[in-house]
Interface confidence: low
């Protein structure tokens, strides 16, 4: 084994490097010392270190770590805040388009119906919309609502044009009416199986994405302990002290000294594999009823459907609510 | 059948919707950042070696540094830590994980079972049993056509009408996206619902 | 052999507190999420609450929501419920139970082991 | 929430005898749907999960069937010890919901 080249002399080398760590050259001695108040570069001769210098190293050494940790995530973690704010951005326009379709289908079809199916259909892919960003709404509920509050309007506008002002009041009665006599057919039940199971399915997806950066965002930041900063003092500096500025550290050294400082962000390795894999399982089965902008998009023809389905039993629904509703001043029919 | 509302772009600024030759799917883009997520598959595994391989290291040198003295790069004291009295690296691995990193793993836990919870078999369609007058959605299309709901007459073909340009994702300042910053952690987010999935703490 | 011990139950008056804990053994504690289930006298199983491996995220059912608080001490391989503002229908067995993880996508709620209760009595 | 019903309430069977338990839902559950077997102080026991997969050390004469709103749990030839209370739950929706529970008794 060569014997280490002697160190520095003067020291002049070291303060000269030193200098861009620390301005100031109190710290680094003039000529080399012994170092016995050392912690981490112990010396086996004279060392060109102070206590205070090794502490300086140390903490370089931990930024140094931070700043190569924050690089080697920077692609990882531009992908998926790029994709997470692209897809929020896109879902939210796919609800603004599917409302506008909805909206287009009133007025080019039902235009008679228009003022107050606007409104509904505007509260319902409001909660659409929340529903994505993770509210706590009933998906089932937004759908019965928004048929709730369609079947009066369609029954006194549509069924019944000429029904008199004073009747107006059987509201709550075509309500209760719409879901007994299922006036709508399956039609209520069929958007509910569409609507929820690709919200629910586009909701996690965009949450498996926040929760990628969060990943991202705990390993990015994360604090290594003394001992690392130790090693890596070691690995990266003390070479320094014995005036041996040039020097690299040995490959399979550094490797021991990573997985020893990064035995804990290893952990999350399989943890990660398995989000990977269970993201990409997800996202193959995003189709048909499981995708969102298949489903919203085409509510507006399901909607139509549900309204012909309703006009072509006008005739017999007419006579059964007229008797149902026909006195609901006295007597509701709920 | 229903009047199809084709003037109704209103984003046409931001997305040009209806007109962009490649025709880029919010489906295609979720696969392909599928791929491009299954590159960093192995990211952490693969972390200590790609800090080694991005900090100075003794790779055409004959002489390296392995702690406490000068050695040749292929001795067996090159990968040896030359303070083993120092402390104890074996102790270093055993202190197990920080709790921020636990904490991140139970999140992680978390979503890879609701992830799988939500993940549909393929091949499923719509349920049959739509009305009493037989009703049906049928199986139809591919992943662009779909059919969606209605009835005989009224079923029509819908075709994915929101497509993307890659400038969208440009278009949006990264820097102010969520989750550039470290988040707070609330520290005791009780989601009273398995529903309420907005973020998982 | 997994094993879950519950012990903590007891008679209170209403509006008293309780505090419930669950033994576990047997398996990785640490690796699997925790639930209580209950069972009023004569009646069938109702679900209380539920904890997260690490105890990041709690879910409970809204009849206690806000009156219990689930927990866990991982490295005691324990489970706790503290039950405050108690009511006369909150008395029923107590059981904790295993979360399981069949196939990768079973979620927490699919109870692949229980314990033997223990008694919960809220009465004046 | 989800409500399960199960029916019969009670069913009187002998040893030997095919038995077989109703659970409906109020709304779809897909087939996140498990049976548990419950005996007089004892605690659950998992049978079947996901409708139809039996659950570890469950013997095969026990299968579940069913998707949707609809499910069924089929002893084929009932043993002494299985005569407990049996029931049906929802892990599809949250909350999780149970059954009301159907009791197995000996004829």
């Known amino acids: 084994q060569p014997p280490p080249p002697p160190p520095d002399a003067t020291c002049h080398q070291v303060r000269s490097f030193f200098q861009r760590l620390q301005p100031g050259l109190k710290w680094v001695p003039e000529t080399p010392v012994p170092g016995s108040d050392l912690q981490v570069c112990l010396p086996k001769g004279p060392t060109c270190c102070s206590r205070k210098m090794e502490e300086k190293y140390q903490l370089t050494a931990r930024l140094n770590m931070e700043q190569l940790l924050q690089s080697a995530s920077m692609e990882l973690k531009f992908l998926i805040i790029q994709n997470a704010a692209v897809f929020q951005e896109a879902f939210e326009i796919v609800v603004r388009h599917a409302k506008n379709y909805t909206n287009a289908m009133f007025k080019n079809n039902y235009p008679s119906l228009t003022p107050q199916a606007f409104e509904f259909v505007g509260e319902f892919f409001t909660d659409v919309s929340l529903y994505i960003l993770g509210s706590d709404i009933n998906v089932d509920d937004m759908v019965n609502e928004l048929f709730d509050s369609l079947f009066p309007v369609i029954y006194t506008q549509l069924m019944n044009p000429g029904l008199p002002d004073s009747a107006l009041d059987i509201n709550e009665c075509l309500r209760g009416a719409r879901r007994d006599l299922k006036v709508f057919g399956n039609f209520p039940k069929l958007i509910m199986t569409q609507v929820s199971k690709s919200l629910q399915v586009t909701r996690i997806f965009l949450q498996a994405l926040n929760l990628g950066i969060e990943v991202i965002n705990t390993t990015d930041h994360l604090k290594f302990s003394k001992d690392c900063g130790r090693m890596l003092t070691r690995m990266w500096y003390c070479s320094y002290c014995q005036g041996l500025m040039m020097v690299k550290p040995c490959g399979g050294y550094c490797n021991v000294v990573m997985q020893g400082c990064m035995a804990g962000v290893v952990e999350i390795d399989k943890y990660w594999r398995e989000y990977i894999l269970s993201l990409e399982e997800l996202v193959n089965g995003m189709y048909r009823i499981y995708d969102m902008e298949n489903v919203l998009l085409g509510l507006f023809s399901t909607i139509h459907d549900s309204i012909q389905y309703v006009q072509k039993n006008a005739g017999k629904l007419t006579t059964t609510i007229g008797k149902l509703c026909a006195h609901s001043q006295q007597r509701q029919y709920r | 059948s229903a009047y199809y509302p084709e003037d109704l772009f209103i984003d046409k600024k931001v997305l040009k919707v209806a007109h962009v030759e490649h025709e880029e799917t919010l489906s295609s883009r979720r696969r392909e950042l599928i791929q491009k997520l299954k590159s960093f598959i192995s990211f952490y595994s693969a972390l200590p070696g790609y800090i080694c391989s991005h900090s100075p290291v003794a790779e055409n040198d004959t002489l390296c540094w392995n702690g406490q003295e000068l050695v040749e790069r292929y001795s067996q004291k090159a990968a040896r830590n030359g303070m083993k009295n120092q402390f104890n690296l074996h102790e270093l691995k055993m202190k197990g994980p920080e709790p921020v990193v636990s904490q991140i793993i139970d999140k992680l836990k978390h979503i890879n079972q609701l992830l799988r919870t939500m993940s549909m078999p393929k091949g499923r369609v719509l349920d049959k049993n739509l009305d009493e007058e037989g009703f049906e959605s049928g199986d139809c299309g591919d992943d662009e056509d779909e059919c969606i709901g209605g009835s005989g007459d009224g079923m029509i073909k819908v075709k994915n009408q929101l497509r993307f340009l890659a400038e969208l994702a440009y278009d949006l300042d990264v820097d102010d996206a969520p989750g550039n910053s470290q988040q707070a952690t609330p520290k005791d987010n009780e989601i009273s619902t398995f529903h309420n999935l907005g973020n998982v703490h | 052999e997994v094993q879950l011990v519950e012990t903590g139950g007891g008679l209170v008056q209403p509006g008293g507190s309780l505090r419930l804990s669950c033994a576990a053994s047997?398996?990785?504690?640490?690796?699997?999420?925790m639930n209580w289930v209950r069972q009023a006298p004569g009646k069938g199983l109702e679900w209380v609450s539920y904890?997260?491996?690490?105890?990041?995220?709690?879910y409970y059912a809204d009849s206690v929501k806000g009156r219990f608080t689930i927990s866990r001490d991982n490295a005691k391989n324990s489970l706790y419920l503290q039950m405050n503002s108690l009511r006369d229908e909150d008395t029923a067995v107590y059981y904790c139970a295993r979360g399981t993880y069949y196939y990768g996508s079973g979620n927490y709620f699919l109870f692949d082991y229980w314990g033997q209760g223990t008694t919960v009595t809220v009465s004046s | 929430e989800i409500v399960l019903t199960q029916s019969p309430a009670t069913l009187s069977l002998s040893p030997g005898e095919r038995a077989t338990l109703s659970c409906r839902a109020s709304q779809s559950v897909s087939s996140y749907l498990a049976w548990y077997q419950q005996k007089p102080g004892q605690a659950p026991r998992l049978l079947i999960y996901?409708?139809?997969n039996r659950a570890t050390g469950i013997p095969a004469r026990f299968s579940g069937s069913g998707s949707g709103t609809d499910f069924t749990l089929t002893i084929s030839s009932l043993e002494p010890e299985d005569f407990a209370v049996y029931y049906c739950?929802?892990?599809?929706?949250?909350?999780?919901?149970f059954g009301q529970g159907t009791k197995v008794e000996i004829k």
């Open positions: 996901d409708a139809s």
């Open positions: 739950q929802q892990r599809s929706n949250w909350p999780p919901t």
């Open positions: 047997g398996f990785s504690f640490s690796s699997y999420a």
């Open positions: 904890i997260t491996s690490g105890g990041s995220s709690r």
